[in-house]
């Protein structure tokens, strides 16, 4: 899994008038990390683990960056011509990634009223637009605005790419939290399914980093993919992750089945409780 930093900003307009505030969230490695507190006009860490990433450093840089990006996005929304009556939203999602081979990715996506209409690979400057005519119109509108001051735009987007990666590297380098290894807690439960069958569920929780293998085995051999159900690997709000895998087995054959877990080079097997 690459390390990633994801900015999610939203600005609103009402009856064609762009509202003064903005909403902002930042995710680090898929975990809620920062949000913009509109009352205090400050970037705030999301939970203890986020505070631990920067230790005792202030969040002034993050506050400044989010404020600037919110201002830019409000200006962009003001230039969208087809705003009708009522409430409308413009959302910008920016993601930068550092992969294991040290290669980087950086992308930017614009949504109007929740619909994607423009994406950019920031490193290569390639823009992509969905096929719908509404998306094409919106994209042309926004790109024309961004092109009005080509030099500013060029500088802005390359700086944005560099800044995102620079911030991500800063968090990775300064943080013991992001280099830690937290082994999962594994718990196996059983529940009655239909007559003669039971559903066995294996849950792994509170692990970091995100990469994990969790699978059911019968007599030491992994079951086929289509006989198992997997949950997504989701953040649990504490800077760690959780997931699960379930399968249906015949009652009385529990002893033949084990849950196999592999995480950060360690592995373990877990029996079905009788």
């Amino acid at each position: 899994e690459p390390h990633s930093l994801r900015y999610n900003l939203t600005v609103l307009s009402w009856d064609g008038s762009v509202q003064s505030g903005f909403l902002a969230e930042v995710h680090l490695d898929g975990q809620p990390f920062l949000r913009y507190d509109r009352q205090k006009c400050r970037a705030k860490p999301q939970g203890q683990w986020a505070e631990d990433v920067l230790g005792n450093k202030t969040w002034d840089r993050e506050t400044r960056d989010l404020t600037g990006n919110g201002k830019d996005l409000r200006m962009t929304l003001a230039h969208i011509k087809d705003q009708k009556e009522g409430l409308h939203s413009l959302q910008e999602i920016r993601v930068c990634e550092i992969h294991e081979d040290n290669s980087t990715r950086s992308s930017q996506h614009f949504y109007y009223d929740g619909e994607l209409f423009l994406s950019q690979n920031v490193e290569t400057e390639e823009w992509t637009v969905p096929q719908s005519s509404r998306a094409q119109t919106l994209a042309m509108n926004v790109r024309n605005f961004l092109k009005e001051d080509a030099m500013k735009t060029k500088t802005h987007y390359h700086a944005m790419h560099a800044d995102c990666l620079q911030e991500l590297r800063r968090y990775l380098e300064s943080s013991v939290v992001l280099r830690r290894r937290v082994p999962p807690m594994v718990n196996v439960t059983r529940s009655e399914a239909s007559e003669g069958n039971i559903t066995v569920t294996c849950r792994a929780s509170s692990f970091y980093p995100r990469n994990i293998t969790l699978t059911w085995r019968q007599d030491g051999v992994s079951l086929s993919h289509d006989t198992q159900q997997w949950g997504d690997v989701l953040p649990d709000g504490n800077g760690t992750y959780q997931t699960w895998v379930a399968t249906r087995i015949c009652q009385g054959e529990e002893q033949r089945f084990t849950c196999y877990m592999e995480h950060s080079g360690n592995h373990s097997t877990h029996p079905v409780p009788s």
Epitope: E100, S119, E125
Partner: antibody
Framework: QVQLQESGPGLVKPSETLSLTCTVS?????????WNWIRQPPGKGLEWMGF???????KYNPSLKSRITISRDTSENQFSLKLSSVTAADTAVYYC????????WGQGTTVTVSS | EIVLTQSPATLSLSPGERATLSCSAT???????FHWYQQKPGQAPRLLIY???NLASGIPARFSGSGSGTDYTLTISSLEPEDVAVYYC?????????FGQGTKLEIK
Amino acid sequence: QVQLQESGPGLVKPSETLSLTCTVSGYSITSDYAWNWIRQPPGKGLEWMGFVSYSGTTKYNPSLKSRITISRDTSENQFSLKLSSVTAADTAVYYCARGYGFDYWGQGTTVTVSS
Amino acid sequence: EIVLTQSPATLSLSPGERATLSCSATSSISSIYFHWYQQKPGQAPRLLIYRTSNLASGIPARFSGSGSGTDYTLTISSLEPEDVAVYYCQQGTTIPFTFGQGTKLEIK
């Protein structure tokens, strides 16, 4: 109809600078897209060399970075390649191409590096 | 840089047969930045399939593409004699853009 046409000398001496120009018709190079140089040594595969984008940004293949310059002349709707300190290994067919998924190509020009 | 490896290096099939060409990347690629090209002897390459699965203008429907992440496939459902060419995959996710080494398609 978008067309790209490479031009430049077919023979360059070792240690000299290779210079090629791509003339674009049917589309403005400042409107959109990346404008690329790609080469193919005899009997070998394709190598992306670099591009100048619609905004004027240049990106180069790190394997050539110290020797390559791509520039553009917006008034003539042209972009150019300069490759310095050439050797026999730079002998190839040189193509200019539009885009990121290269949708339009020039027909290619053969450049031989030889004394 | 992302290295693309094509397989097989050479494919020799009869007219009407199905051809499957593979391209594997050393790092994950976004499917919208993955493309296939066809190059016939003495000609410039031409875009065949863009963004993994979209047919370029003028390309017959017997060509199709699929894939995601690190593994991509070009399929020709029923080979025609004019399909003799070298086929290249290419990624535009990161700089430098890179091509596979090519698969040479021959007709028996």
